[in-house]
């Protein structure tokens, strides 16, 4: 008996061929011997089966001795053995209909789990293999689960269902809702304006939700909310903003925050969380601010950085166009009795300058000793 695999919601065409290449009488029945359809001359006739409104044939093929049964909008319960009776012969076709669906929604937050559930007819024992957009293969039976979804899991998942050495392929589009970057770091000189941007890695027609930037300043004993906001159809409205610092927020996407000036007391790290309408859970993006200050107090030239710096970063003080006078893997360096000229404070990572601040040291004129 021939086996045909079908997909829930699709259309399937079961073939039945006579040896004579002409229109002759045929009938399609199910395993209960209930007539589905047939012909009377050149007319299509239908029986009392449940498929009545979804069953059809192709009259244009009858003259060639082909009498297909077309079933539209397939259901799992359409799985059955179908019998074509033509020329005193019986052709049996076993139809197995499968469905594959994502757990609840195909739009999932980063870090959430994706569960794919296979609907299959009783008595079948299919195996499923799915390939993610990044080429990761997962296998299973009735359910397949992928925990901790990542941004790279966005796209078309291709799943193959195998049964009786036949296969049927499903394609499911998954959108992982996330920020483009999990973390970012901004390096600024003291007094400079700071721009924080939080671009999303997905586009949807209507984006509604709410969010907050929660900040832990390096110098502060506890963290606090810097700003809370609402998002309605991609329009941003500020709900509450702390008085210090007085952050400003752009009214359109991408989410954009401006800190009027970088100050040592603001250096630290923050977490922007975004809750989306009809989703439980939140999107997160970490943001870090490193602030540099170069000062000269009497005979001491000092350069300091505040904020989350990696231990491999190098802080240096050098006179312009000369070798570094001091270079350390520390957050503060200084030079006593610096010579006159333009001094540079540099924060660098493996030779790449991340932040630079210049300070001019004026010559110190020694006052003549009074006779």
């Amino acid at each position: 008996k021939k086996v045909v695999l079908g997909k829930k919601g699709d259309t399937v065409e079961l073939t039945c061929t006579a040896s004579q290449k002409k229109s002759i009488q045929f009938h399609w029945k199910n395993s209960n011997q209930i007539k589905i359809l047939g012909n009377q001359g050149s007319f299509l006739t239908k029986g009392p089966s449940k498929l009545n409104d979804r069953a059809d044939s192709r009259r244009s093929l009858w003259d060639q001795g082909n009498f297909p049964l077309i079933i539209k909008n397939l259901k799992i319960e359409d799985s059955d053995t179908y019998i074509c009776e033509v020329e005193d012969q019986k052709e049996e076709v076993q139809l197995l209909v499968f469905g594959l669906t994502a757990n609840s929604d195909t739009h999932l937050l980063q870090g959430q789990s994706l569960t794919l559930t296979l609907e299959s007819p009783p008595g079948s024992s299919p195996s499923v293999q799915c390939r993610s957009p990044r080429g990761k293969n997962i296998q299973g039976g009735k359910t397949l689960s992928v925990s901790q979804l990542e941004l790279q899991d966005s796209g078309t998942w291709t799943c193959t269902v195998l049964q009786n050495q036949k296969k049927v392929e499903f394609k499911i589009d998954i959108v992982v809702l996330a920020f483009q970057k999990a973390s970012s770091i901004v390096y600024k000189k003291e007094g400079e304006q700071v721009e924080f941007s939080f671009p999303l890695a997905f586009t949807v027609e209507k984006l509604t939700g709410s969010g907050e930037l929660w900040w832990q300043a390096e110098r502060a004993s506890s963290s606090k909310s810097w700003i809370t906001f609402d998002l309605k159809n991609k329009e941003v409205s500020v709900k509450r903003v702390t008085q210090d610092p007085k952050l400003q927020m752009g009214k359109k996407l991408p989410l954009h925050l401006t800190l009027p000036q970088a100050l040592p007391q603001y250096a630290g790290s923050g977490n922007l969380t975004l809750a989306l309408e009809a989703k439980t859970g939140k999107l997160h993006q970490e943001v870090n601010l490193v602030v540099m200050r170069a000062t000269q107090l009497q005979k001491n030239l000092t350069c300091e950085v505040w904020g989350p710096t990696s231990p491999k970063l190098m802080l240096s003080l050098k006179l312009e166009n000369k070798e570094a006078k001091v270079s350390k893997r520390e957050k503060a360096v200084w030079v006593l009795n610096p010579e006159a000229g333009m001094w540079q404070c540099l924060l660098s990572d493996s030779g790449q300058v991340l932040l630079e601040s210049n300070i001019k040291v004026l010559p110190t004129w020694s006052t003549p000793v009074q006779p």
């Epitope: 509604t208 939700g209 709410s210 907050e212 929660w214 506890s222 606090k224 909310s225 809370t228 609402d230 709900k239 509450r240 702390t242 008085q243 210090d244 969380t273 809750a275 309408e277 439980t280 859970g281 939140k282």
Partner: antibody
């Protein structure tokens, strides 16, 4: 350790006045919005009023508007609730609360002070 | 004003049971929702903020979900100390409002 200690509650006649105080410690008081929340005996919670970090914005529930005034003194780390024209329905434990939680949640509560309005 | 309706007003359970409390807002409040626990004679304690985030130090058997108008607080496995009263509260717009409370009682 964050601490909020209310005082000033007591028995007062209808139409009378009372001033509640809340002494805050263990955090930078001037950096947080503060609220008063009350609970009538055997009943649920009712938010009464709140005040911005510098005292420039204040919000009240309709039932106390024009009768109660929320204020703060950041130099003294103190929050106040001036209650005038008191009614029997104002009888409740009044809590001083910090609005310091993420997503505007009320993260620290005092132990409460009982206000009883009765003749 | 936004009305917050909690249900049920009381629920009975045994140690180890799973309990779900729901809170419905009269209009959409996005995720501006918090859940509090109150023990008799004590001040309320914050459990969940932003509808689904667990406050630091709160046991993981407590979880919150929902957004918009419908929210739930779930206690996955009741412990003896959980048989108290729970309140939801919206922080979407003033005046902030609380649900009427749900008392979790021993069966």
């Amino acid at each position: 350790e964050v601490q909020l200690v209310e005082s000033g509650g007591g028995l007062v006649q209808p139409g009378g006045s009372l001033r509640l105080s809340c002494a805050a410690s263990g955090f930078t008081f001037s950096s947080y919005w503060m609220s008063w929340v009350r609970q009538a005996p055997g009943k649920g919670l009712e938010w009464v009023a709140n005040i911005k970090e510098d005292g420039s914005d204040k919000y009240y529930v309709d039932s106390v508007k024009g009768r109660f005034t929320i204020s703060r003194d950041n130099a003294k780390n103190s929050l106040y609730l001036q209650m005038n024209s008191l009614r029997a329905e104002d009888t409740a434990v009044h809590y001083c609360v910090r609005e310091g939680g993420q997503w505007l949640a009320l993260d620290y509560w005092g132990q409460g002070t009982l206000v009883t309005v009765s003749s | 004003d936004i009305q917050m309706t909690q249900s049920p007003s009381s629920v009975s359970g045994s140690v180890g049971d799973r309990v779900t409390i729901t809170c419905r807002a009269s209009q959409g409040i996005s995720s501006w929702l918090a859940w509090y626990q109150q023990k008799p004679g004590k001040a309320p304690k914050l459990l969940i903020y932003g509808a689904s985030s667990l406050q630091s130090g709160v046991p993981s058997r407590f979880s919150g979900s929902g957004s918009g108008t419908d929210f739930t607080l779930t206690i996955s496995s009741l412990q003896p100390e959980d048989f108290v009263t729970y309140y939801c509260q919206q922080a979407n717009s003033f005046p902030w409002t609380f649900g009427q409370g749900t008392k979790v009682e021993i069966k």
